[in-house]
């Protein structure tokens, strides 16, 4: 008989689960990289672009060595949920201005959503404590101008790119400890 109803199902091979999560993260990272190249090509914008509503980068190198799987997955899921919300906001607020970046933005959103579901599944497979539902986040204010929206797009994609690299590094490091 299988596990009792409602209890998480133990994964036969957590390393394989982690490996498939890493690969999905990397494919999302490649989508992000290619979209960033398109964005820079079509809407050049020099310098660093910041958006206060984006999550701060999760970890430094020193902290990466001390990571535990629950904290990585919890933090990663929270950060990616924020990026998903920002991508959705970007597509709604900037639909006409960024239409040259569709369907790539849509594909990115779909794959981001898929990675979030994979993380949720991984957490349950590894019998990690499930998080309570996220409180509703305050709505994001529409960009003040088209240029403001383009700068926001640069910030969102740049931040996501770096977050995904951090995620891959953290997950690979944890895989070696399993």
């Amino acid at each position: 008989p299988g596990p009792p109803p409602g209890s998480p199902r133990a994964s036969p091979d957590p390393r394989a689960e982690l490996d498939s999560t890493v690969l999905l993260t990397r494919s999302l990272l490649e989508d992000t990289r290619q979209l960033t190249i398109q964005l820079k090509d079509k809407f050049p914008a020099d310098g660093d672009h910041n958006l206060d509503s984006l999550p701060t980068l999760a970890m430094s190198a020193g902290a990466l060595g001390a990571l535990q799987l629950p904290s990585v997955l919890t933090r990663l899921r929270a950060d990616l949920l924020s990026y998903l919300r920002h991508v959705q906001w970007l597509r709604r607020a900037m639909g006409s201005s960024l239409k040259t970046l569709e369907p790539e933005l849509g594909t990115l959103q779909t794959r981001l959503d898929r990675l979030l579901r994979r993380l949720q599944l991984l957490m349950s497979r590894l019998a990690l404590p499930q998080l309570p539902p996220d409180p509703p986040a305050p709505p994001l204010a529409p960009p003040s101008s088209t240029w403001g929206g383009i700068r926001a797009a640069h910030a969102i994609l740049g931040g996501l790119h770096l977050t995904l690299d951090w995620a891959v590094r953290g997950l690979l490091l944890l895989k070696t400890r399993l």
Epitope: D19, S20, V22, L23, L24, T25, R26, S27, L29, E30, R33, L57, M59, S60, A61, G62, L64, H161, L162, L164, D165, W166, V168, R169, L172
Partner: antibody
Framework: EVQLVQSGAEVKKPGASVKISCKAS????????MDWVKQAPGQRLEWIGD????????IYNQKFTGRATLTVDKSASTAYMELSSLRSEDTAVYYC????????????WGQGTTVTVSS | DIVLTQSPASLALSPGERATLSCRAS??????????IHWYQQKPGQAPRLLIY???NLESGVPARFSGSGSGTDFTLTISSLEEEDFATYYC?????????FGQGTKLEIK
């Protein structure tokens, strides 16, 4: 022009350490990882490891863990690789190479640094 | 570690001919919509140069006579019409997981 310029050739005795530098120019240093690759005479190219300049966080090939140390100086757009406890098999050309984040393919390479380990 | 085997080890052709270089992986390197195989060219005394990334994407500045194909475990680099400057050693590399590894190379020589 995007360029990686490495430090000059080194001759070392067995047991010593060597530190090679790689100065990046022509691109935003923190937008890419920096990887290091070994090419020994008659051997396959061998990946040593990489480092993300924004967060530090090196990842090493297990074969080099404990002997290779990768660091960066962001303000100088320079990456370093130190290899300790040198032995004759470490005689090789060492390359730094720019890597796409978390993808480990290398689109710009340094000119290479020859390290000779000999007593 | 994934082992990449390139064939042939060497190949002698004339300028204008078509070159087909093969790379076989010991396990699949394709997943989640991408094939993690890359191709480089190296000339004596020089650093390798990226030609193709993710199996079929032509690197910026690389002539269109170079193309990459394949998925799973079998990959091919094709040079449609050889030029004098194409005679060199070619390496495939995978990045499906860590560590990335390289093939032993195919040396392309002038006939």
């Amino acid at each position: 022009e995007v360029q990686l310029v490495q430090s000059g050739a080194e001759v070392k005795k067995p047991g010593a350490s060597v530190k090679i530098s790689c100065k990046a120019s022509g691109y935003t240093f923190t937008d890419y990882n920096m990887d290091w690759v070994k090419q020994a005479p008659g051997q396959r190219l061998e990946w040593i490891g990489d480092i993300n300049p924004t967060i530090g966080a090196p990842i090493y090939n297990q074969k080099f863990t404990g002997r290779a140390t990768l660091t960066v100086d962001k303000s100088a757009s320079t990456a370093y690789m130190e290899l300790s406890s040198l032995r004759s098999e470490d005689t090789a050309v060492y390359y730094c190479a720019r890597g796409a984040l978390a993808h480990w393919y290398f689109d710009v390479w340094g000119q290479g640094t020859t390290v000779t380990v000999s007593s | 570690d994934i082992v990449l085997t390139q064939s042939p080890a060497s190949l002698a052709l004339s300028p204008g001919e078509r070159a087909t270089l093969s790379c076989r992986a010991s396990k699949s390197v394709s997943t989640e919509g991408y094939s993690y195989i890359h191709w480089y060219q190296q000339k004596p005394g020089q650093a390798p140069r990226l030609l193709i990334y993710l199996a079929s994407n032509l690197e910026s500045g690389v002539p269109a006579r170079f193309s990459g194909s394949g998925s799973g475990t079998d990959f091919t680099l094709t040079i449609s019409s050889l030029e004098e400057e194409d005679f060199a050693t070619y390496y495939c590399q995978h990045s499906r997981d860590l560590p990335p590894t390289f093939g032993q190379g195919t040396k392309l020589e002038i006939k």
